[in-house]
Interface confidence: medium
């Protein structure tokens, strides 16, 4: 029997193919720099296969090395606005459990209105990823301008 | 028999490893904002394994979740030029079939001369991806400055 | 027996899951534009599974198509600094063997202080990747601001 056929007969989760792509739901209340995410086919092209959302933050379900990627576009923005409100900074990190808290990815907007990046990082089951946007400017909720995702790469 | 050995005996296409990396061929005629792509070993380091080109646009051959990535650098550009000719915007989307038309990824250049981003998105067999560059500035065709690719990630 | 279990019994290397994520160690001496990288669990979240470091440069151990990604943030930087010292340019390329020398990825900072991008490219066993930063500004060694990695995608 061909592997490709056998592959289809196993639950994908057993293959370690955890993956998620999220769209922005809302920003946090004052003093909470976190972005709150949402995902699922009912919302458009976002999805969660393996990871879960916990109060708008992404929780990992499988140990492994992940590719984490993000793009955030500021909602009302020109290079002048961006520089006047500088620094607006985005940081992606593990925010819980507290013992594993660390910043994984950090970018400033400077005179631009969009940041986009990606990196490989080890994540463990139970790690929750938070995306903190500091500064006075707000992110766009357009699904083609602001998104956040992870892809399991290997154990 | 070891999986690694078995893996080699199956056509890679049966493993769902569709992947493509394209280089810029040319821009469209007036009123056509699309970038036209090309790929293949004769052209350098670009390739298509699974997806195909249809009149310079990338057509998907296998359903699944894909990582789509792009980098575009403007050919004649400094931060001054970029801001003077603003807004120059790049959008990647499904342009056919019309029923599935949607923008997947959008970025503006503001005072920069390069945009680069990536995202995970579900794509279906027959989806054609278009990359629209709007504005008066034109992209560089240097293969290390402008490129567009997709990678099948999971069903 | 489930594939997922069988998978665990094979060395991951036999599955072709080569992957590396590196953090900046130091810049080169004057006239050497290369960035020197380091990786390993003792250093934090960087790692090498398959590829190796050769005098701070990344050497590939398995033929295949790789996703190469990088982010570099300049250490003492504002949009004013970046434009005054323009162009500061980052190029990722194969630097040895000399017969395969080629630039794979190139970005300028213009008025920004961070560049980030990624691309798919064929690499061969023995290829060494170099990352050249030209200009007078220096990169940040913060592990969430500057990193470089590769991920094997398919043969």
């Amino acid at each position: 029997q061909r592997f490709a056929q056998a592959q289809q007969q196993l639950p994908l989760e057993s293959l370690g193919w955890d993956v998620a792509e999220l769209q922005l739901n809302h920003t946090g209340p004052q003093q909470d720099p976190r972005l709150y995410w949402q995902g699922g086919p009912a919302l458009g092209r976002s999805f969660l296969h393996g990871p879960e959302l916990d109060k708008g933050q992404l929780r990992i379900h499988r140990d492994g090395i992940y590719m984490v990627h993000i793009q955030v576009t500021l909602a009302i923005c020109s290079s002048t606005t961006a520089s006047r409100h500088h620094p607006t900074t985005l940081a992606v990190g593990i925010c819980s459990p507290a013992s594993r808290s660390i910043s994984l990815l950090r970018l400033s907007f400077h005179q631009g209105c969009t940041i986009a990046s990606q990196r490989l990082t080890p994540l463990a089951r139970g790690d929750t990823l938070c995306t903190n946007l500091t500064g006075t400017l707000l992110p766009s909720r357009n699904t083609d301008e602001t998104f956040f995702g992870v892809q399991w790469v290997r154990p | 028999q070891r999986f690694a050995q078995a893996q080699q005996q199956l056509p890679l296409e049966s493993l769902g490893w569709d992947v493509a990396e394209l280089q810029l061929n040319h821009t469209g005629p007036q009123q056509d904002p699309r970038l036209y792509w090309q790929g293949g070993p004769a052209l350098g380091r670009s390739f298509l394994h699974g997806p195909e080109l249809d009149k310079g646009q990338l057509r998907i051959h296998r359903d699944g979740i894909y990582m789509v990535h792009i980098q575009v650098t403007l050919a004649i550009c400094s931060s001054t030029t970029a801001s003077r000719h603003h807004p120059t915007t790049l959008a990647v989307g499904i342009c056919s079939p019309a029923s599935r038309s949607i923008s997947l990824l959008r970025l503006s250049f503001h005072q920069g001369c390069t945009i680069a981003s990536q995202r995970l998105t579900p794509l279906a067999r027959g989806d054609t991806l278009c990359t629209n560059l709007t504005g008066t500035l034109l992209p560089s065709r240097n293969t290390d400055e402008t490129f567009f690719g997709v990678q099948w990630v999971r069903p | 027996q489930r594939f997922a279990q069988a998978q665990q019994q094979l060395p991951l290397e036999s599955l072709g899951w080569d992957v590396a994520e590196l953090q900046l160690n130091h810049t080169g001496p004057q006239q050497d534009p290369r960035l020197y990288w380091q990786g390993g669990p003792a250093l934090g979240r960087s790692f090498l599974h398959g590829p190796e470091l050769d005098k701070g440069q990344l050497r590939i151990h398995r033929d295949g198509i790789y996703m190469v990604h990088i982010q570099v943030t300049l250490a003492i930087c504002s949009s004013t600094t970046a434009s005054r010292h323009h162009p500061t340019t980052l190029a990722v390329g194969i630097c040895s063997p000399a017969s395969r020398s080629i630039s794979l990825l190139r970005l300028s900072f213009h008025q920004g202080c961070t560049i980030a991008s990624q691309r798919l490219t064929p690499l061969a066993r023995g290829d060494t990747l170099c990352t050249n930063l030209t200009g007078t500004l220096l990169p940040s060694r913060n592990t969430d601001e500057t990193f470089f990695g590769v991920q094997w995608v398919r043969p």
Partner: antibody
Framework: EVQLLESGGGMVQPGGSLRLSCAAS????????MSWVRQAPGKCLEWVSA????????FYAESVEGRFTISRDNSKNTLYLQMNSLRAEDTAVYYC?????????????WGQGTLVTVSS | EIVLTQSPGTLSLSPGERATLSCRAS???????LAWYQQKPGQAPRLLIY???SRATGIPDRFSGSGSGTDFTLTISRLEPEDFAVYSC?????????FGCGTKLEIK
């Protein structure tokens, strides 16, 4: 073989107008950006104007902006430069130059040039 | 605008000798977007080098280019009689495209 042949040059008084043409052959004209470059007697080369392959995008040197108009007719494989409000300092040999591809880098082919003299 | 300054203004050498021509930019040229042209009296310029170091089609390998940022060099390893001409550099990374005023290479 790529060939570029300029015409339309001549003597004109200050404030007058001229229209230069450049007939192209040996390549797919509509695919390539084109430029006009000039050289005053004994002086440096100076880029004047550029136009994209489709004709949809045009760029000008500050010294000619508002006075010169670049255009092309892809059905006739011809590039044009309409020069109005000419000044003495516009006196030069005007070259038509082909960019190496549609998006404006270096000039890989040049015409032999046509002389424009602005004098009273 | 990027100003390109070429030196020397005139270079007198004999056939068989090595010629080194310099082109300095007032600010860094983006991503080595620099070209070199050869021009003989009464003729149009001819492309020699693009991308600071890539030889154009049909250009003999005695011509080589190097440099990045603000300093660029054109080298002719062994001068042939037909090489005596004016050599100009040009940056094409930003508008306006600008040229150097040329180095005249003459027979000694």
């Amino acid at each position: 073989e790529v060939q570029l042949l300029e015409s339309g040059g001549g003597m004109v008084q200050p404030g007058g107008s001229l229209r230069l043409s450049c007939a192209a052959s040996g390549f797919t004209f509509s695919t390539y950006a084109m430029s006009w470059v000039r050289q005053a007697p004994g002086k440096c080369l100076e880029w004047v104007s550029a136009i994209s392959g489709s004709g949809g995008r045009t760029f000008y040197a500050e010294s000619v902006e508002g006075r010169f108009t670049i255009s092309r007719d892809n059905s006739k494989n011809t590039l044009y430069l309409q020069m109005n409000s000419l000044r003495a300092e516009d006196t030069a040999v005007y070259y038509c130059a082909k960019h190496d591809y549609s998006n404006y880098p270096y000039f890989d082919y040049w015409g032999q040039g046509t002389l424009v003299t602005v004098s009273s | 605008e990027i100003v390109l300054t070429q030196s020397p203004g005139t270079l007198s050498l004999s056939p068989g000798e090595r010629a080194t021509l310099s082109c300095r930019a007032s600010q860094s040229v983006r991503s080595t977007y620099l070209a070199w042209y050869q021009q003989k009296p009464g003729q149009a310029p001819r492309l020699l080098i693009y991308g600071a170091s890539s030889r154009a089609t049909g250009i003999p390998d005695r011509f080589s280019g190097s440099g990045s940022g603000t300093d660029f060099t054109l080298t002719i390893s062994r001068l042939e009689p037909e090489d005596f001409a004016v050599y100009s550099c040009q940056q094409y990374g930003d508008l306006p495209f600008t040229f150097g005023c040329g180095t005249k290479l003459e027979i000694k």
